[in-house]
């Protein structure tokens, strides 16, 4: 039988490599069963997650899941960083994984670095 | 039920690239990350890298970073391995395993693996 | 990288009796959401690892229960708490915690 609590599906340890001034789209997947919860997604600030209030979001929903988008319209440099989403369900706090952006600032970077050197040596992002 | 099967060229020259496909069924590879492990005769495992094949994004071992390439194909539901400069210390058993989604996210599933031999 | 170092590499052991392999890293394995990645895998001959252990201390399914895990931060150690002829094989530890993923580097078992 399959568990009817609310699923935050982002994979551990992910990480995304954008481009400043493009748009993107973050997705937390979520699975429920009957109500959909209320998802708000937060930037890590250190050990603590600061709560995105003003940012566009929205919901696509797909067969099996949905996904609760956090949109970069478009991405900026200072975007770079930790986020998580996280869902209230029946009076309980549900935290994803964090997901990682590694945002190039195409002004600056006169060469693309890889996605594993932006991994590695994350000050390139602010050369 | 979960598959994964690798394959490619058993003999490789050296100086050559070394180049591995795995073909995954069973399950959809955006949903989880790729790795690929090789195993020298006679010696243990060595993590290579891993790779998310929803976005591409890729982890490399330091020490092969600058000669391995890992890439997906979300349609076909497949992973690669591109190693370059090889020598005969690249000669081993190299697999690829899918590290499962929440909320364990280890290498549950394996490929039987496929023996690359570096030499002229 | 994580350094991980498992002890003894190999040992003999008459039908029956325990096992105990050890495995030690050079940093924590506990990770930001409060886990730990410490996994363990048995290779047989010809074969390819299979994964015994997950998040320290659970069993895969179809494992038999004689196979247990502990440990926390960074000691681990596998158990086989009554040797069978079909455990004779090379065992594995693996950090899923941090990057570069790193094994160590395997413990054999045999029977005497």
């Known amino acids: 039988k399959e568990s009817c609590d609310v699923q935050l599906y982002i994979k551990r340890q992910s990480e995304h490599s954008i481009l400043a001034g493009d748009p993107f789209e973050l997705e937390c997947p979520v699975k429920y069963c009957a109500n959909r919860p209320h998802v708000t997604w937060c930037k890590l600030n250190g050990t603590t997650c600061v709560k995105l209030e003003d940012r566009q979001t929205s919901w696509k929903e797909e067969k099996n899941i949905s996904f609760f988008i956090l949109h970069f319209e478009p991405v900026l440099p200072n975007d770079n960083g930790s986020y998580r989403c996280s869902a209230n369900f029946q009076s309980n706090l549900i935290e994803s994984h964090s997901t990682t952006l590694y945002v190039t600032d195409v002004k600056s970077a006169s060469e693309r670095p890889s996605k594993d050197e932006m991994a590695s040596r994350p000050w390139l992002l602010y050369r | 039920q979960v598959q994964l099967q690798e394959s490619g060229p058993g003999l490789v020259k050296p100086s050559g690239t070394l180049s591995l496909t795995c073909a995954d069924s069973?399950?959809?590879?955006?949903?989880?990350?790729i790795h690929w492990v090789r195993q020298p005769p006679g010696k243990g495992l060595e993590w290579i890298g891993r790779i998310d094949p929803a976005n591409g994004f890729t982890r490399y071992n330091p020490s092969l970073k600058s000669r391995v390439t890992i890439s997906s194909d979300k349609s076909k539901n497949q992973a690669s391995l591109k190693l370059s400069s090889v020598t005969a210390a690249d000669t081993a058993v190299y697999y690829c395993?899918?590290?499962?989604?929440?909320?364990?996210?280890?290498?549950?599933?394996w490929g039987q693996g496929t023996t690359v031999t570096v030499s002229s | 990288d994580i350094v991980m170092t498992q002890s003894p590499d190999s040992l003999a052991l008459s039908l029956g009796e325990r096992a105990t392999i050890n495995c030690k890293s050079s940093?924590?394995?506990?990770?930001?959401?409060?886990?730990?990645?410490l996994n363990w895998f048995q290779q047989k001959p010809g074969q390819p690892p299979k994964r015994l252990i997950y998040?320290?201390?659970k069993l895969d399914s179809g494992v038999p229960d004689r196979f247990s895990g502990s440990g926390s931060g960074t000691d681990f150690t596998l158990t086989i708490s009554s040797v069978q002829a079909e455990d004779v094989a090379v065992y594995y530890c693996w950090q899923g915690t941090h990057f570069p993923r790193t094994f160590g580097q395997g413990t054999k078992l045999e029977i005497k």
């Open positions: 998040l320290v201390s």
């Open positions: 940093q924590s394995l506990l990770d930001v959401d409060g886990k730990t990645y």
């Open positions: 395993a899918r590290e499962d989604g929440y909320p364990y996210y280890t290498l549950d599933a």
């Open positions: 069973g399950f959809n590879i955006k949903d989880t990350y």
